[in-house]
Each structure stands twice: as C-alpha cells, then as structure tokens.
C-alpha cells in the first residue's frame, strides 16, 4: 500500500460509511442479529481531553491492537454466520466487507509506520494502559463498535500520524 | 496556586472585532490543551474550539469557523480568542478553560456586550 | 451534528435523589462529562469519564449511561445542589466538543 493512502480522508471515510452502513442495516433484525455468544472487542470510548495530551506511541498501542482485536472478533462472527441458517445471507455480504476492509486498514496503518511505532520506544508500549475490551452479542453492537473505532482513535491516530509526515 | 485570569468586559459595535486574553499562571503553559467556551445571558454553554499552546494548531467548532482565530504567546502564558463580524447575539460571557482529564481550570470569564 | 438534549429544570426535594438526564444519539457508547454552574460563577466539573469523580466532589454524586441516555444522580440533596448542570461529550464526527443545553436543578423545602 502506498504509504501515504490513509491520509487521504476519502479513503477512511469510505470505510466509516461501509461500517455505519453495516450498522444501520443490523439495527433492523430481530434482537440485533444475535450472534449466539460474546465476541471480545476493543472499548472505544475516548476521553479526548486525556488522549490529546497524551504520546503518540501510547496511540499507535491503542490502535493496532484494537484493529487487531476487532479483526478477530469480525471473523469470528463471519464464522458463525456460515454456521447459522437463521441470519439472512446480506448480512454475510457486510461482514465480509468489514473483514476485507480491516485487512485493508491494517496495510495501510502498517504502511504509514503504526507497528513500528507501537512497539518503539519500549517505553510507550509498558506504559500504555492494557486494552480495555467490551463483549459484543450481536451484529448491530460489533458494527457499532467498528463504527466508532473508525470515527474514535483511528481517524484520530492517522490523523495526527499524517500531520507528522508532512513536517 | 493554578488560574487562568482573563481580559475585562468590552462593549462592541456589529460588525467589530474583539480579543480576549487569558493568562495562565501556576502550571506549564504549554502542557495543557486551552479550550474557549461562550456563555449568552440565560443561555447554555457553548464550545467554541481549543487551541494546543505547544504548538499553536487549533480546532474550531463548524459554527464559529471563518470567524474566530485562537493564538497564544508562550513567552507571557497567555491565550488569545478573537472573534470577527460581531452581531448582537455575540453578547456572551467567553470562558478560557484548561484542559486536563476534562475542563478542570476555567478563567473567571469576559462580558463582551455586542450593541449598536 | 451531534446534539445532546436535556431537561430544562428538575425538581426534588431536600434529602431525596435527583436524576438528570442527557440524551444523545449512542450515547452510551461515550464519556459524558458533568459541570454545575451557580449563578455568576465558572462551570464546575462533578462527574468525569461517565462515572468518575474528581477529588472534592462528595460521593453523593453520581453519574451512569447506556443506550441514549447518560444520568447524573445526587442523592441526598441539599440546598447547596442548586444550580444549572451541563452534561458534554465529544461529536466523533467533527472531533469537536458538544454540551447539552442545561438543567436548571431546584432543591424543594
């Protein structure tokens, strides 16, 4: 990926207006398209007072292991879809979607330097608080919380990822 | 002890411009994100955008941009807000407030009175 | 944009609970943030990060939230509770900061 592609806001906003419109679609099945059992995902509330002052490697932790726990969760749940005959076939459609857009988002932070600044310095990775995680389920809920990660701390991170490249 | 004081009240033409300080006193004036937030008589609060004091970079609110620019001057730890195009319903008392875990230091407010 | 809505005023009586809601769009999904503001003075903050409260706030004061609604409880209501309080969370959209628009708190007896 082209390092640089992220920061181009078109392209995250491509993938915020796919999760959001996964979520509206999942709004509308009964109990939220339950997924049978609970998936860990990332939390993604944000104190933005705290995260503004806070360093840009505690950031990239905070990312890329959400990205990496919400990447899971995503195939976890694209796996109990191919088991259940009860959910109706588009929503596969918008679970697939969302599996090869985090894949796609996580070439793209790696190209733009997250992983490596998630673990260098040693010191932004100890001292980042561990992930905390919420359980979600169904569809509606991981679609949600997908939404809000994209719109949350990863437009925040690449934002600011972006801006330190161009000086 | 930490606070923020702030310039005295202004009374303004529409269409004028005003600046308001806000000096801050007893912490690191670059450690700590300032935010400016507006009060109309009787009304609510209203944020108006923050300003990063370390390195000046700002983000406005959708309503007041095109007409409000946040500053500050390391060297006397002080903010500035100036808003342009002043109309009647400008009239407002405008808090600075610090930013920490939340807006934990606030300035004692600036009556800016907007009238003909 | 995002908005948060609350009640203009509430009303409870002295030594009981009042609740004052902040309704918004997921906003569960948030930290909200309390302020109370008394006449001529800066807003206060009471409630952090939904439920956290800074040192010098009584425990009497509490705040929840799910769904669409984040609460703000003070039990045990005194006199000295009357205010307006503010309720402010974070518009994901805009990165920008939003307040409700305030409730007027009255303590009755």
């Known amino acids: 990926a082209p390092a640089r592609l992220i920061c181009d806001s078109r392209v995250l906003e491509r993938y915020i207006l796919e999760a959001k419109e996964a979520e509206n679609v999942t709004m509308g099945c009964a109990e939220g398209c339950s997924l049978g059992e609970n998936i860990t995902v990332p939390d993604t509330k944000v104190n933005f007072h705290h995260w503004k002052k806070s360093e840009a490697g505690r950031h990239a932790v905070e990312v890329w292991q959400g990205l990496a726990l919400l990447s899971e969760a995503m195939l976890r749940s694209q796996a109990l879809l191919a088991n259940s005959s009860q959910l109706p076939e588009t929503l596969q459609v918008h679970v697939d979607k969302a599996v090869s857009g985090l894949r796609s988002l996580t070439s793209l932070l790696r190209a733009l330097g997250v992983q490596k600044e998630a673990v260098s310095p040693p010191e932004a990775a100890s001292s980042a608080a561990p992930l905390r995680t919420v359980a979600a389920d169904t569809l509606c809920k991981l679609f949600r919380i997908y939404s809000n990660f994209l719109r949350g701390k990863l437009k925040l991170y690449t934002g600011e990822a972006c801006r330190r490249g161009d000086r | 002890q930490v606070q923020l004081v702030q310039s005295g009240a202004e009374v303004k033409k529409p269409g004028a411009s005003v600046k308001v300080s806000c000096k801050a006193s007893g912490y690191t004036f670059t450690s700590y994100y300032m935010s400016w937030v507006r009060q109309a008589p009787g009304q609510g609060l209203e944020w108006m955008g923050w300003i990063n004091p370390l390195k000046g970079n700002t983000n406005y609110a959708q309503k007041f941009q095109g007409r409000v620019t946040m500053t500050r001057d390391t060297s006397i730890s002080t903010a500035y807000m100036e808003l342009s195009r002043l109309r009647s319903e400008d009239t407002a008392v405008y808090y600075c407030?610090?930013?920490?875990?939340?807006?934990?230091?606030w300035g004692q407010g600036t009556l800016v009175t907007v009238s003909s | 944009s995002y908005e948060l809505t609350q009640p203009l005023s509430v009303s409870v009586a002295l030594g009981q609970t009042a609740r004052i809601t902040c309704s918004g769009d997921?906003?569960?999904?948030?930290?909200v943030y309390w302020y109370q503001q008394k006449p001529g003075q800066a807003p206060v903050l009471v409630i952090y990060d939904t439920n956290k409260r800074p040192s010098g706030i009584p425990e009497r004061f509490s705040g929840s939230n799910s769904g669409n609604t984040a609460t703000l409880t003070i039990s045990r209501a005194q006199a000295g509770d009357e205010a307006d309080y503010y309720c402010?969370?974070?518009?994901?959209?805009?990165?920008?900061?939003?307040f409700g628009g305030g409730t007027k708190l009255t303590v009755l007896g």
């Open positions: 407030a610090r930013e920490g875990m939340y807006f934990d230091i």
């Open positions: 997921s906003i569960g999904d948030k930290y």
């Open positions: 402010q969370s974070w518009d994901l959209d805009f990165n920008t900061y939003v």
